[in-house]
Interface confidence: low
């Protein structure tokens, strides 16, 4: 009778560095000591008639056991293979370009340490949840690669390295590790320089808007511009409108940077650069500056009007023109009445680069005089009639501006000067208008003829 | 010395989201690992998930899976757990804390950030 | 889920008398790898939990020793020798054998 060794469990898997029940039994009556030949370390547990039990312990790769044992002086054997998975230790994908030219071929490197049995692991490179590359682990470490052509739906996308252990036929399921994702940065710069738009002329010490432009840029947002005069930073305001970028800032010139000057952009993606460059003249251009001798004069006193600018700028005033550029224009007036408020108008022209710029300016002279009171205004007398309206019409001129008051002779009885008055019979009788300032009085008699009231 | 300083207290509407960071110092931040776990007012401790911030592999408990996430910013050492569809027994102190290896004890906690989900 | 029973939940000491608390796993807490992952957490008035003993018997550095903890497979224990003042708090055992990670619900030492 032919006798079996049975070993349990038979070709069990198991997780690496796992520990395992080994069963070694017979059904021959008169079996000796089972024996267990193994390499792992194995320790017995328990035997009787026909059975003995083991632990295999840190079970670290594939093994075979072998149960042997003699029946009736005959040696009969058993075995069982072991299978040992283990996931992977590291599952790594490669640092990606900082930035990536769309339209060009990029790399995609995953490394795997670890991971067995080898011919059940495969590792998939993937871009968001789309697989790019499946292919099996071999060496060790398991190196994968794929070739990836980046297009702009590229920018952003997170990717990643996926290992699969399918441990699905020996009824364990299938163990997936991922990497840490990368992120990839894809552009596009155009090999087209900027647009710039600044000024040709910039006086010291004032403002002007220079713009640089840019279209067919992509990630427009992530664009780095640097806008300059000569050596000085200018600070932009960055614009973004789909694929097209604006700098805006403010061009200041200092006096230090007088002549001929460069304004300079520079647009900067994926570490490639565009430039553009205009050429622009700083000037100087003081004034004009109009001066009174006496800004505040006296009637009959002399004043004497000058206008004045920088070097190369020629000044004309109130249409007298300057002997030469950069010298002053003058001129000299008996200060009377007339003249109070009387406006000196000065241009001045500056030429820059054969352009000719102008400004102007002017200056209002004050003379002081005293009060008076013009008759041709006031009427002396004035044939009213009782209980009607009516406004006197009296004006008053001087340097300062004079007060006029009219009180009736002999009383303290004041009219409204300008201002229309319910006359009565009351009024009748002569008034003095007096017109008073710091200056002096002038005082002019009115009388008023009040026509009593008919009842018929 | 290692310290887990985490963001300030939250005070959310039902369905909303919250964010709450936790930025690690004085140990390399990729070496270890990041645990979150909450504490309803009066209640005991509730684990919710972990992070590997070197490979940025995570684990969540069942309890809240959909609704957690967690991330990793290594490039400033901060951790982040958000999570949405917030619910009135969500209110409770939330603790971000590290482990060294799997699977070892939560050695280092954050100071905690309370999160309140009232309408 | 691994279910961490504590007991008792409520524990008034007397300030150096011994103090002991047991905790015990609904499922064996060895690891594959053969270690015990129980551990041990205080959470002090006011304060964040803070580790005292790691991995059953492990006392994290800093930590008094006269806190210890014993224990195998599924039946755990912690162990004040003399209770001090300072001890006052919840304590938590919690696994980290099997995922998710769980907590015992807390024990309250206070004061008599």
């Known amino acids: 009778q032919e006798f079996l060794l049975r070993v349990e469990p038979q070709n069990p898997v198991l997780s690496a560095g796992g520990s395992l029940f080994v069963n070694c039994s017979t059904d021959c009556p008169s079996s000796e000591k089972i024996a267990l030949e193994t390499s792992l370390s194995k320790e017995l547990v328990a035997s009787g008639m026909g059975w003995a039990a083991f632990n295999l312990s840190n079970v670290t790769g594939n093994s075979r056991i072998l149960c042997s044992v003699y029946c009736n002086g005959s040696q009969i054997t058993g075995s069982s293979n072991i299978t040992v998975y283990g996931l992977p230790e590291r599952v790594e994908l490669a640092p990606l370009p900082p930035w990536q030219p769309v339209g060009q071929n990029f790399t995609l490197r995953c490394q795997v340490e670890g991971g067995s049995p080898r011919t059940s692991l495969t590792v998939v490179l993937l871009r968001w949840e789309e697989e790019l590359s499946r292919q099996p682990a071999v060496e060790e470490p398991a190196e994968v690669t794929a070739t990836v052509l980046a297009s702009r739906d590229d920018h952003g996308a997170p990717f990643s390295c996926r290992t699969e252990l399918d441990m699905q036929p020996q009824g364990l399921g299938l163990f997936v590790n991922t990497s840490a994702p990368r992120q990839l940065r894809t552009f596009v710069l155009p090999v087209t320089p900027p647009r710039l738009v600044a000024p040709r002329f910039l006086e010291v010490e004032t403002s002007w808007p220079v713009d640089c432009t840019l279209d067919g840029l992509f990630p427009a947002s992530e664009a780095q511009v640097y806008l300059a005069l000569g050596d000085q930073m200018l600070n932009a305001t960055v614009m973004n409108h789909g694929d097209t970028l604006t700098a805006t800032a403010t061009a200041t010139a200092r006096a230090d940077q007088e002549g001929a000057r460069e304004i300079v952009c520079n647009v900067t993606l994926g570490g490639e650069r565009r430039e553009a460059r205009e050429n622009l003249t700083v000037f100087s251009f003081l004034g004009p500056i109009v001066n009174l001798s006496e800004p505040t004069a006296h009637e009959g006193s002399t004043v004497t009007v000058s206008c004045m600018a920088g070097a190369r700028v020629q000044v004309t005033l109130d249409g007298v023109p300057a002997a030469a550029p950069g010298q002053t224009a003058q001129l000299q007036l008996n200060a009377t009445e007339s003249d109070d408020g009387r406006s000196f108008f000065c241009s001045a022209t500056l030429e820059v680069d054969g352009e000719f710029l102008h400004r102007n300016s002017s200056v209002q002279l004050r003379v002081l005089y005293g009060p008076k009171i013009d008759r041709a205004t006031c009427p002396q007398h004035l044939k009213w009639k009782d209980k009607t309206r009516h406004v006197l019409q009296c004006q008053a001129r001087g340097n300062p501006y004079p007060e006029l008051r009219c009180l009736k002779e002999g009383s303290s009885r004041e009219v409204p000067v300008g201002i229309p008055f319910f006359v009565n019979v009351t009024h009748n009788g002569t008034y003095q208008c007096q017109a008073s300032s710091s200056r002096g009085k002038y005082t002019l008699v009115v009388v008023m003829d009040i026509e009593a009231f008919s009842s018929h | 010395q290692v310290q887990l300083v985490q963001s300030g207290a939250e005070v959310k509407k039902p369905g909303a989201s919250v964010k709450v960071s936790c930025k690690a110092s004085g140990y390399t931040f990729t070496d270890c690992i990041i645990l979150w776990v909450r504490q309803a007012p009066g209640q005991g401790l509730e684990w919710m998930g972990k992070i590997n911030p070197y490979f940025g592999t995570t684990t969540y408990a069942q309890k809240f899976q959909g609704r957690v996430t967690i991330t990793a910013d290594t490039s400033t050492s901060t951790a982040y757990m958000e999570l949405s569809s917030l619910r009135s027994e969500d209110t409770a102190v939330y603790y971000c804390?590290?482990?060294?290896?799997?699977?070892?004890?939560?050695?280092?906690w954050g100071q905690g950030t309370l999160v309140t989900v009232s309408s | 889920d691994i279910v961490m029973t504590q007991s008792p939940l409520s524990l008034p000491v007397t300030p150096g008398e011994p103090a002991s608390i047991s905790c015990r796993s609904s499922q064996s807490l060895v690891h594959s790898n053969g270690d015990t992952y129980l551990h041990w957490y205080l959470q002090k008035p006011g304060q964040s939990p803070q580790l005292l003993i790691y991995k059953v018997s492990n006392r994290f550095s800093g930590v008094p020793d006269r806190f210890s903890g014993s224990g195998s497979g599924t039946d755990f224990t912690l162990k004040i020798s003399r209770v001090e003042a300072e001890d006052v708090g919840v304590y938590y055992c919690?696994?980290?054998?099997?995922?998710?990670?769980?907590f015992g619900q807390g024990t309250k030492v206070e004061i008599k």
């Open positions: 919690s696994q980290s054998t099997h995922v998710p990670y769980t």
């Open positions: 804390a590290r482990k060294e290896a799997y699977p070892d004890a939560m050695d280092y």
